[in-house]
């Protein structure tokens, strides 16, 4: 069973009091219908709350919305709906915060039928004032914010217009029409596609790619044939056309779409998809769906270029298009991703890496739980986690798993301990060192989150009923102590805390409901008087990550390199700060063949780490194109993984071969690389 | 088999300092924490701090900080604790022991294996 | 630093005799606890770390539990070789140890 209050735990001394003088609940005077709420800034305490209430009449249905700050993290609000005259807020355009501490937030207002465009409020600072602006177009999209300069914003129209503002939406431009999708790239510039004869549907797959880098003055365009598009950490990626199939593959450009490279990964038919699962600068996860309506697909692991995959996971659980996938990245341990696989027998099983995709194994067993009815062996199973998927069955599961950077290792997440994932209600389960080992933390399904990085865990009851408890631990979820934070239960709808996990602060959202009506209420407690003091050096300890054999000289080495942490010892009830900073110290590998993934032409056999040369590249459905044009490719079969540190040690070093092969893509010819003015 | 062989007995006089190694053998040396403790006649045990040998982080004992250095070199499996302004309370037997480890924490599995001792003698 | 109080400090016992130790942290520890043994002029061995997990090679009579604040070390039966000083040390804060049980025959 999972640890509870009993004699042995550590407690917090008098929290009852000292909650009770910290937490503090606000009535808003507004009918129940939705919530919405958005943090501006960063420690900066505002929130802003949006209410929206629909009453259907018979011809139209008519809207209300009220907008509230707060500037204490929650334990104040003040209505501010005057300050936007009162207007109705589109709620699926949300609330549109900018990036950083930019203080810029934009709201959607509805508007009436016949109106030349939308129009918006505009703040920048920090939601205390608004601006009223009319725009000429109707949105289609929330404004995008690009994320180099908060002052200029993109948009998409209904009539599909791409429209541009340099002045923080106070004055706009139409800088392309015919526009599908269009983002954000590096240093303020824009992609896009665009059709030529129809409409987006219409002209799947013979879309054109364009690029501006000066807010459409002038463009370039840089593909062709093109189905769709997505950005990636330094790669930007194109599912372009074959000439003569109904098939697409995936090029890839680091040079923000100058030159191409045909990606080392199979085509896909016109009901199958690629997703980019997760990217960063060094490498990237691309989920490649199976031919037929299988649900899975294929998960491939890039080289630094974006161009040779390896195969890393088989029959990777992913429904449709945009559909649910579980893949998790675990941002408290480097290198740590979780996901689902579809059996063979249908059943859905959670697998983890460690290591950047290179191995996936298993959830190794709770200590303190038993097998379920799943398993076979009833000493012998696995513990499976409950993601999106589970979520999109609705399954009794209120959340994902959670992670954060700065609560080193902490992972929490609802499972089941079995062969599979069970349809049973699920237990909450932790783990302290990014998923090694795992520790059934409460019984039953519950809402969760992590304040003070990892100082606290906060926890609330998932039930039908209303709720007037929460729990909290101070021991990374081994001891667990409740606290009745009102004498009304109410009907719980959320759990709310700053982003970042720095905060000591939390928010529960919920109504209570009477004969007569029903009200939005919040109660927000601050945590600081339970974290009586600052953590001091003798607060923390040392841990190495991904420790498994102390025995072994390389114990902790993942991708060329171990990181120790300080990190906070359990039975320290002290604040660790907002201005806390992860204390890590890095010591470099020697190299092992490990380190290396084979390059393009290579494979390795299995259980081998060597590097063999393909017999013939022909049987192996694979084309290779560098830049667009044949190329020689010159390897010694090896590349070293992204990311990876190490030094020394193994150098596979042997002789350098040309390989040789016809590049059949068609993508770009150098005439389509010429560029056009506005 | 993990060894620890520490260097011979000192004698000392107050307000001196005394520096005792600790050479492993057998093992990976630098996977482990080496903690420090000693025992001074007819007393219980008193651990005076340690090191992880990869990286060097040390931490001591609230009581001998600033008067404790306790280092180690990975190129020759060895941790050394100086102790300086030597005092007649310091007289007793000192211990290397290295910190069993299960997991990625260095300390919180027991003292596994111990040295043979060193005797420190401080007497003017 | 977490203080570390160990009682009895002397406790005189037969060969066969149930024999148990206990130990309390001035604060919770969870389970990071360590009991040793020491006889005269050798270094002190480790036979119980977790609380509760045997460390390789000690004889299964001896046996730890406890978690939090209060701790135990049981000799299910007293054999000669076990006449000896005992030590309680916990791992969650600075190291400290306790003051020690000498285990005598009666």
């Known amino acids: 069973s999972a640890p509870g209050e009993d004699e042995e735990c550590g407690r917090v001394r008098d929290f009852v009091a000292k909650l009770a003088n910290n937490t503090h609940q606000h009535v808003f005077d507004d009918l129940r219908g939705s919530v919405s709420l958005s943090w501006v800034g960063d420690s900066t305490g505002v929130i802003l709350v949006l209410t929206t209430f629909h009453v259907p009449l018979v011809i139209m249905t008519f809207g209300q919305s009220k907008l509230y700050r707060s500037e204490d993290y929650g334990k104040n609000f003040k209505d501010i709906t005057d300050l936007i005259n009162n207007t109705f807020i589109r709620t699926e355009f949300g609330m549109a915060i900018g990036p950083e501490n930019s203080g810029k937030v934009v709201l959607t207002a509805e508007v009436s039928g016949g109106s030349r465009g939308g129009r918006i409020f505009r703040s920048s600072d920090f939601a205390k004032n608004f601006v009223q602006t009319d725009l000429p177009f109707h949105p289609l999209t929330q404004m995008m914010y690009s994320p180099q300069n908060s002052d200029y914003l993109l948009a998409l129209s209904t009539e599909n217009g791409l429209w541009v503002s340099k002045n923080f939406g106070g004055k706009w431009e139409e800088i392309h029409k015919a526009v599908c999708l269009a983002k954000w790239g590096s240093d303020n510039t824009i992609f896009f596609t665009t059709y030529a004869n129809g409409s987006c549907k219409a002209d799947l797959g013979a879309l054109e790619l364009w690029r501006t880098s000066d807010l459409g003055k002038s463009f370039k365009t840089i593909g062709v044939k093109i189905y769709s598009f997505g950005l990636g950490g330094r790669f930007l990626f194109a599912s372009v056309m074959a000439d003569k199939d109904t098939t697409r593959r995936i090029h890839v450009s680091t040079d923000q779409g100058d030159t191409w490279s045909m990606a080392q990964l199979p085509s896909v038919g016109q009901e199958q998809f690629y997703s980019i699962l997760a990217a960063n600068d060094d490498m990237v996860f691309m989920h490649v769906d199976e031919p037929g309506d299988t649900g899975f697909g294929t998960i491939f692991t890039s080289d630094d270029r974006g161009i040779v995959y390896s195969k890393s996971l088989d029959r990777h659980l992913y429904t449709t298009t945009g559909g649910e996938t579980d893949f998790t990245n675990v941002t408290s341990l480097r290198g740590v991703y979780i996901t689902s696989v579809l059996s063979e027998d249908n059943s859905i099983q959670t697998m983890i890496t460690f290591d950047q995709g290179g191995r996936w194994t298993h959830l190794r067993k709770p200590e303190n739980s038993e097998c379920d009815a799943t398993a076979k062996n009833k000493n012998e199973c696995s513990l499976h986690i409950h993601a999106s998927y589970s979520i999109s069955q609705k399954l009794n599961v209120p959340m994902a798993p959670l992670s954060e950077p700065n609560a080193v290792g902490i992972v929490i997440a609802h499972g089941s301990v079995g062969d599979a994932i069970s349809v049973m209600v699920p237990d909450v389960y932790i783990s302290d060192d990014g998923g090694y080992s795992w520790t059934k933390m409460l019984e039953g399904p519950h809402y969760y989150t992590i304040l003070d990085s990892g100082g606290i865990i906060v926890a609330i009851e998932h039930s039908s009923r209303p709720i007037n408890v929460i729990k909290f631990s101070t021991d990374e979820g081994q001891c667990w102590q409740t606290y009745t934070f009102t004498r009304d239960p109410i009907y719980f709808t959320g759990l709310a805390s700053e982003p970042g996990a720095r905060s000591m602060n939390i928010s529960i959202w919920g109504f209570t409901e009477s004969a007569l009506t029903s009200q939005w209420v919040s109660y927000t407690i601050d945590f600081k008087d339970i974290l009586e003091r600052n953590c001091e050096e003798k607060d923390y300890t040392i841990w190495l990550a991904h420790s498994t054999d102390p025995e072994d000289y390389e114990d902790g080495c993942i991708l060329g390199y171990k990181e120790q942490f300080l990190r906070l010892r359990k039975s320290s009830v002290c604040q660790n700060g907002r201005d806390y900073v992860v204390t890590k110290q890095p010591s470099i590998c020697l190299c092992s063949l490990e380190d290396f993934l084979c390059d393009f032409g290579y494979y390795r056999p299995e259980n081998d780490s060597k590097c063999v040369e393909q017999p013939e590249l022909k049987g192996h459905d694979l084309e290779f194109c560098l830049y667009g044009r044949e190329e020689h490719l010159t390897t010694n079969g090896y590349r070293k993984i992204p990311g990876d540190k190490c030094q020394g040690g193994v150098n596979p070093v042997r002789e350098v071969k040309d390989l040789k092969k016809k590049c059949t893509s068609n993508f770009l010819s150098p005439e389509k690389q010429n560029s056009k003015s506005n | 088999q993990v060894q620890l062989v520490q260097s011979g007995a000192e004698v000392k006089k107050p307000g001196s300092s005394v520096k005792v190694s600790c050479k492993a053998s057998g093992g990976t040396f630098r996977n482990y924490a080496i903690s420090w403790v000693r025992q001074a006649p007819g007393q219980g045990l008193e651990w005076m701090g340690g090191?992880?040998?990869?990286?060097?982080?040390?931490n001591y004992a609230q009581k001998f900080q600033g008067r404790v250095t306790i280092t180690a070199d990975e190129s020759t499996s060895t941790a050394y604790m100086e102790l300086s302004s030597l005092r007649s309370e310091d007289t007793a037997v000192y211990y290397c022991a290295r910190q069993g480890r299960k997991t990625g924490y260095y300390y919180y599995y027991g003292m596994d294996v111990w040295g043979q001792g060193t005797t420190v003698t401080v007497s003017s | 630093d977490i203080q570390m109080t160990q009682s009895p400090s002397t406790l005189s016992a037969s060969v066969g005799d149930r024999v148990t130790i206990t130990c309390r942290a001035s604060q919770s520890i969870s389970s990071w606890l360590a009991w040793y043994q020491q006889k005269p002029g050798k270094a002190p061995k480790l036979l119980i770390y977790k609380a509760s997990s045997l460390e390789s090679g000690v004889p299964s009579r001896f046996s730890g539990s406890g978690s939090g604040t209060e701790f135990t070390l049981t000799i299910s039966s007293l054999q000669p070789d076990d006449f000896a000083t005992y030590y309680c040390?916990?791992?969650?804060?600075?190291?400290?140890f306790g003051g020690g049980t000498k285990v005598e025959i009666k």
């Open positions: 090191i992880i040998p990869i990286g060097g982080w040390a």
């Open positions: 040390q916990q791992a969650d804060g600075h190291i400290t």
